[in-house]
Interface confidence: medium
Amino acid sequence: EVEKTACPSGKKAREIDESLIFYKKWELEACVDAALLATQMDRVNAIPFTYEQLDVLKHKLDELYPQGYPESVIQHLGYLFLKMSPEDIRKWNVTSLETLKALLEVNKGHEMSPQVATLIDRFVKGRGQLDKDTLDTLTAFYPGYLCSLSPEELSSVPPSSIWAVRPQDLDTCDPRQLDVLYPKARLAFQNMNGSEYFVKIQSFLGGAPTEDLKALSQQNVSMDLATFMKLRTDAVLPLTVAEVQKLLGPHVEGLKAEERHRPVRDWILRQRQDDLDTLGLGLQGGIPNGYLVLDLSMQEALS
């Protein structure tokens, strides 16, 4: 806590300018009016204040706004934002996308900090949903943002926002997240024609059910192996050899290199060996000829 001392004669700050860099901490506390600081926050960034001096300026704003800063001040915080704690940010009500952008710019090139995560959380909650403009902004600054959300949080993403998602934004998503995003993507892209639709939906297919994969196999999509390997195992298992062949097209040859990895390994175990042999890839591990295949899931459903 900075002790209260009177401002020396002639040192009272009339504006926020570079002359303040020469002030000691106690002089800043005594000579800078908090209301003046609040109205001239945009000047603070251009002035080479030390962290210690910024701490004093933050302290003055905290005293002026104990309930949280108004957006007019937040928008111009600049690098002072880096001095804020998540607790400080939880008091804010940020509604303007411009304010969000200004603060994300300050953190640009760094990992997402707890401050930024709290800020985004406050902003999204304030808006009620993750609209397209917000998602555009967030993924531009943090490509992995979408995959940092829980399935529950993702459920508030409207299908219209899916248009803003780029393939790299989904790189770190797990199957539970794709399960939520896939139906939204399917809805968003439903009016596109076959090949265009596949290009857009491809990165979301880790959440696709079997019936959608079967439908895609009828459309000559030529899915690459990287996409196939990200499909849900439970969605791939019921596919026939013919369906997988149609789904992958010329990429079917890549199955050989992946035969020991899921979901290919598990899928092979479910196929008749003579069906696998029709691919001419030398895939081994299928059900030998003459063996009876019991669909245990169907049996359980009947009993």
Partner: antibody, heavy 119, light 109 residues
């Protein structure tokens, strides 16, 4: 045009003091801060401190605190840097540089003053 | 203490492109503008780039600056023999106030 002209080379004995001057012209002297930067032979640039010619306020690098004094004489538009308790490691070229307001840049530099500390 | 790290030297043939990196931290490059200075042999430093990527008038557009996170870099294209000099990055540090990089000697082969 803006010009910063520094005093001539100095040779000093260890323990002595040196005072280097920097005369400004071509702009309002009290309108821009003056920094002092030094460069030991074959070494990089090292910031020493800054003075506000308007009020005379100063801010020094931690390393030089207690040994350096920056002053100015507005009547002749000149800034001074005095370094005391000289040691051989203080042998360097000392530059004054004008600080451009609003962003941390040194837009004009003096020609440099070589200070040699030798017994 | 030098808190901005530059490579001690870089070299390139005339006409080539070279880059000089400058690595810092969140208390300097990460939260402030970066400037670059050129020091020709036996002369005072000269401002080359300011505000990360702006050129003062008179500086050829062969010189360009960029910044990402806590690192900055200076690029020189169409290298010329008169570019042979020492180059320094600079910013101010929120802890120690002013900072210069250690300097990089550019040799034109």
């Amino acid at each position: 045009q803006v010009e910063l002209v520094q005093s001539g080379a100095e040779v000093k004995k260890p323990g002595a003091s040196v005072k280097v001057s920097c005369k400004a012209s071509g702009y309002t002297f009290t309108g821009n801060y003056i920094n002092w930067v030094r460069q030991a032979p074959g070494q990089g640039l090292e910031w020493m401190g800054i003075i506000n010619p308007h009020g005379g306020d100063t801010k020094y690098a931690q390393k030089f605190q207690g040994r350096v004094t920056m002053t100015r004489d507005t009547s002749i538009s000149t800034a001074y840097m005095e370094l005391s308790s000289l040691r051989s490691e203080d042998t360097a070229v000392y530059y004054c540089a004008r600080w451009h307001h609003g962003t941390w840049i040194f837009d004009y530099w003096g020609q440099g003053t070589l200070v040699t500390v030798s017994s | 203490d030098i808190v901005l790290t530059q490579p001690p030297s870089v070299s390139g043939a005339p006409g080539q492109r070279v880059t000089i990196s400058c690595s810092g931290s969140s208390s300097n490059i990460g939260s402030n503008y970066v400037s670059w200075y050129q020091q020709l042999p036996g002369t005072a430093p000269k401002l080359l780039i300011y505000n990360d990527n702006q050129r003062p008038s008179g500086v050829p557009d062969r010189f360009s600056g960029s910044k990402s996170g806590t690192s900055a870099s200076l690029a020189i294209t169409g290298l010329q023999s008169e570019d042979e000099a020492d180059y320094y990055c600079s910013t101010y540090d929120r802890r120690t106030f002013s900072v210069f990089g250690g300097g990089t000697k550019l040799t034109v082969l």
